[in-house]
Interface confidence: low
């Protein structure tokens, strides 16, 4: 069979079958909150735009302001727990060894150079790594495993190639804020190509990125939040220069705001990123000032 | 525009250190990257390193990484290049070029006029 | 270090157009390389001519343009004239920023 079409089937039947899955999740979600006479969670917000493309060479780059970002999309209903809810063994299982099947054939065949020279390149690229991360959060830790080395193979491959798209495509399943495992595969390899992300998408990326750091920060999973605080240096040391202020302020303030947390972890994770904020910010001396001032402000 | 001075052509032996200037004509010099850029006589333009004035931040090819300092003096409206353990292969012409970042983050909009560093034993 | 070529001469008839390419020696140039054209004649500085793919520096004439053509940058140079014969070089911007040149195109104007 040619290898775009390998890919193609691959595509539609793990996408079939991971719908179903968040189906099957939505349902019992769905049954848990009635039990608890809760409202149903709002529908999954639509695919994110395309990030802006940096301002023309004849506005000013970097002291004009810059519009808002579009709104944050609506909260997720009740957090998942960090482990998958139960669902039926039998069922799942059945389909595990063809999970990991597919996911093979989709790595093996997107960096294959007769699919690269395709023209609809770009767009299997995004599928591709729109999988993994799904597939990152299967129920079966085979599935996430195989899923885990995938995108690590795929990124490593393409990224001297197509290194803008491997950034686009985390960037949305970041602010797509899912689930706590796609999110975390998401957010580390984020931080660590961040410092690739090319010098006039800093800021468009940077204006893109703050709503989204400043919703993960509210996260009640403490894994999601460990994760964000090893992400956050290496994404401010990349962006922290293009802030302004008022941004730092902003997202210091959703930091400043889980030093209050009942969980140790978090607690610790939050005051990691916000020493790391003020030290990649274009005043760094101010902010470790303004910074102190609050602390000083929470304990009178 | 801003016009770019750099200093006079220099002679340096073989481990010696070499630090070149570059004045920009221009009031509003913090809003200005200087990037550092050689040309061996006879061969191709390469890219040494690059600094912002506002804040700073460099960046440096990993060939010139731990040699090359590259620093801004905002009161004196210069950008400075040191180049440090001289060979006779760094004999170049050694040029600045500058951008308005309010435009444009990275690039070279206008060069400075070039100085010669001859290393030789 | 990853490399950027050039052609290495070209030449073009007094008044005709000439189109020079910057390519990477692996994979395709996009605008996200944001490349920029110098001008170098001998014993002079360069001059830049193009930044970020197609925006003219300040005094640049029209007859300069930057695009990108297929999986290449392109500098086109329009009704060439004999002051235009120089040596060409085309910078792109890699990842947090470096530069790296093209090892530069002699353009002889016939």
């Known amino acids: 069979m040619a290898t775009l079409e390998k890919l193609m089937k691959a595509f539609e039947s793990l996408k079939s079958f991971q719908q179903q899955q968040q189906q099957q999740q939505q349902q019992q979600q769905q049954q848990q909150q009635q039990q608890q006479q809760q409202p149903p969670p709002p529908p999954p917000p639509p695919p994110p735009p395309q990030l802006p493309q940096p301002p023309p060479q004849a506005q000013p780059l970097l002291p004009q302001p810059q519009p808002p970002p579009p709104p944050p999309p609506p909260p997720p209903g009740p957090a998942v727990a960090e482990e998958p809810l139960h669902r039926p063994k039998k069922e799942l299982s059945a389909t595990k060894k063809d999970r990991v099947n597919h996911c093979l054939t989709i790595c093996e065949n997107i960096v294959a150079q007769s699919v690269r020279n395709s023209p609809e390149f770009q767009k299997l690229l995004g599928i591709a790594m729109e999988l993994f991360l799904l597939c990152s959060d299967d129920a079966e830790s085979d599935v996430r495993m195989v899923a885990d080395e995938c995108l690590n193979k795929v990124i490593k491959a393409l990224m001297d190639s197509n290194l803008p798209r491997l950034q686009l495509e985390l960037y949305k399943e970041i602010k797509k804020n899912g689930a706590p495992r796609s999110l975390r595969a998401a957010l580390w390899r984020f931080a660590e190509l961040a410092h690739l992300v090319r010098p006039q998408k800093c800021r468009p990326y940077l204006v893109n990125l703050l709503p989204c750091l400043t919703r993960t920060s509210k996260r009640p999973e403490e894994s999601v939040q460990e994760t964000l605080a090893a992400a956050v240096p290496k994404i401010m040391a990349s962006f922290g220069n293009f802030a302004n202020d008022n941004e730092i302020k902003v997202l210091l303030k959703a930091f400043i705001a889980n030093l209050k947390s009942s969980s140790p972890t978090i607690r610790r994770t939050a005051a990691g990123s916000a020493v790391s904020i003020c030290q990649h910010s274009r005043r760094t001396q101010y902010f470790y000032s303004w910074l102190l001032n609050v602390l000083l402000g929470l304990l009178v | 525009e801003v016009q770019l001075v750099q200093s006079g052509a220099v002679m340096k032996k073989p481990g010696d250190s070499v630090r070149v200037s570059c004045r920009a004509s221009t009031y509003s010099f913090s809003t200005y990257s200087f990037t550092w850029v050689r040309q061996v006589p006879g061969q191709g333009l390469e890219w040494m390193g690059w600094i912002s004035a506002y804040n700073g931040h460099t960046n440096y090819v990993d060939s010139f990484q731990g040699r090359l300092t590259l620093t801004t003096d905002t009161s004196a409206s210069t950008a400075y290049m040191e180049l440090r353990s001289l060979r006779s292969d760094d004999t170049a012409i050694y040029y600045c070029?500058?951008?308005?970042?309010?435009?444009?983050?990275?690039?070279?909009?206008?060069w400075g006029q070039g100085t010669l560093v001859t290393v030789s034993s | 270090q990853t490399v950027v070529t050039q052609e290495p001469t070209f030449s073009v008839s007094p008044g005709g157009t000439v189109t020079l390419t910057c390519a990477l020696r692996f994979g395709s140039v996009s605008s996200s390389y944001y490349p920029s054209w110098f001008q170098q004649t001998p014993g002079q500085a360069p001059r830049t001519l193009i930044y970020?793919?197609?925006t003219r520096s300040s005094g640049v004439p029209a007859r300069f343009s930057g695009s990108i053509l297929g999986n290449k940058a392109a500098l086109t140079i329009a009704g060439a004239q004999a002051n235009d014969e120089a040596d060409y070089y085309c910078?792109?911007?890699?990842?947090?920023?470096?530069?790296?040149f093209g090892g530069g195109t002699k353009l002889t104007v016939l």
């Open positions: 910078v792109l911007y890699m990842g947090s920023g470096i530069g790296v």
């Open positions: 070029a500058a951008v308005d970042t309010t435009y444009y983050y990275y690039g070279m909009d206008v």
């Open positions: 970020s793919t197609n």
